[in-house]
């Protein structure tokens, strides 16, 4: 049995502009004020960190300036958006939530959201 419960959608289709959004929801056992959210990508048994943000409850998520992720929080829900996706980025994106402060520390891992990215067809040249 996993530790803290984390729920996320099974499948999301990225937009034609390479943007995918999904909600990561966790069942908090305590009254955490500081939460860390990490998005991990799993492909061929390799797991890489896509982005991470630590936020204070009630405040906005702050990702690094060069991050491909943005997000907002509302209670125990985090709305995550990943941009700049290409077809080669199709894969399983796992939401990891850590309740950092105050003690106790709780960790939860979602089952992952399969994000499908389809590169847009190039516009045909028009002879006008």
């Amino acid at each position: 049995c996993k530790a803290m419960h984390v729920a996320q959608p099974a499948v999301v289709l990225a937009s034609s502009r390479g943007i995918a959004s999904f909600v990561c929801e966790y069942a908090s056992p305590g009254k955490a004020t500081e939460v860390r959210v990490t998005v991990l990508r799993q492909a061929d048994s390799q797991v890489t960190e896509v982005c991470a943000a630590t936020y204070m409850m009630g405040n906005e998520l702050t990702f690094l300036d060069d991050s491909i992720c943005t997000g907002t929080s509302s209670g125990n829900q985090v709305n995550l958006t990943i941009q700049g996706l290409r077809a080669m980025d199709t894969g399983l994106y796992i939401c990891k939530v850590e309740l950092m402060y105050p003690p106790p520390y709780y960790l939860g891992i979602g089952n992952g959201t399969q994000i499908y990215v389809i590169d847009p067809e190039p516009c045909p040249d028009s002879d006008f």
């Epitope: 049995c1 996993k2 530790a3 056992p29 009254k31 990891k96 003690p103 106790p104 520390y105 960790l107």
Partner: antibody, heavy 115, light 107 residues
Amino acid sequence: EVKLDETGGGLVQPGRPMKLSCVASGFTFSDYWMNWVRQSPEKGLEWVAQIRNKPYNYETHYSDSVKGRFTISRDDSKSSVYLQMNNLRGEDMGIYYCTGTFAYWGQGTLVTVSA
Amino acid sequence: DIQMTQSPTSLSASVGETVTITCGTSENIYGGLNWYQRKQGKSPQLLIYGATNLADGMSSRFSGSGSGRQYSLKISSLHPDDVATYYCQNVLSTPYTFGGGTKLEIK
């Protein structure tokens, strides 16, 4: 100051029951998943059981070695957690620690199983 | 169940040295790993949580690192007070298995 006080250990015959208690203070007990962990020279530290809190409907989890014999329970109004141990075996011997989500630990109580 | 393989089982080092203890897991535990210090005759004490975070009141000479299936605990500038047995533990999922422990002694 955080305190966890375990009681109830001692000498017990194989096959007999024993109940351990742990009273906590100094932290918000209801926010914590409470666990029992035991320590023996043969097995080192071994997680035994966990009881989660109200948001998790007081779910219980056990190690395979004690499943069906041990029962963990809690009383948030008394900031207490219990371990009812039935049909005790030699391999259950050790120091039993009560721990709040592994952040805070009690001093331990020794359980000896012998005829 | 997740298996924890801790090494070495014992370690002897001199005051001022830096030592490293490693913990391997049978599957990816996504950083769900704690380290504990247990001194002779005392209860275990949380040292590092979530693989890299130092627990309140613990010396900054202790640091944790790792991800996936491989983790390590580093003790810098060894003190005589660091004599203890150190354990890693999976906290991602039940059963919350512990490593076999590393007994640290001072030369």
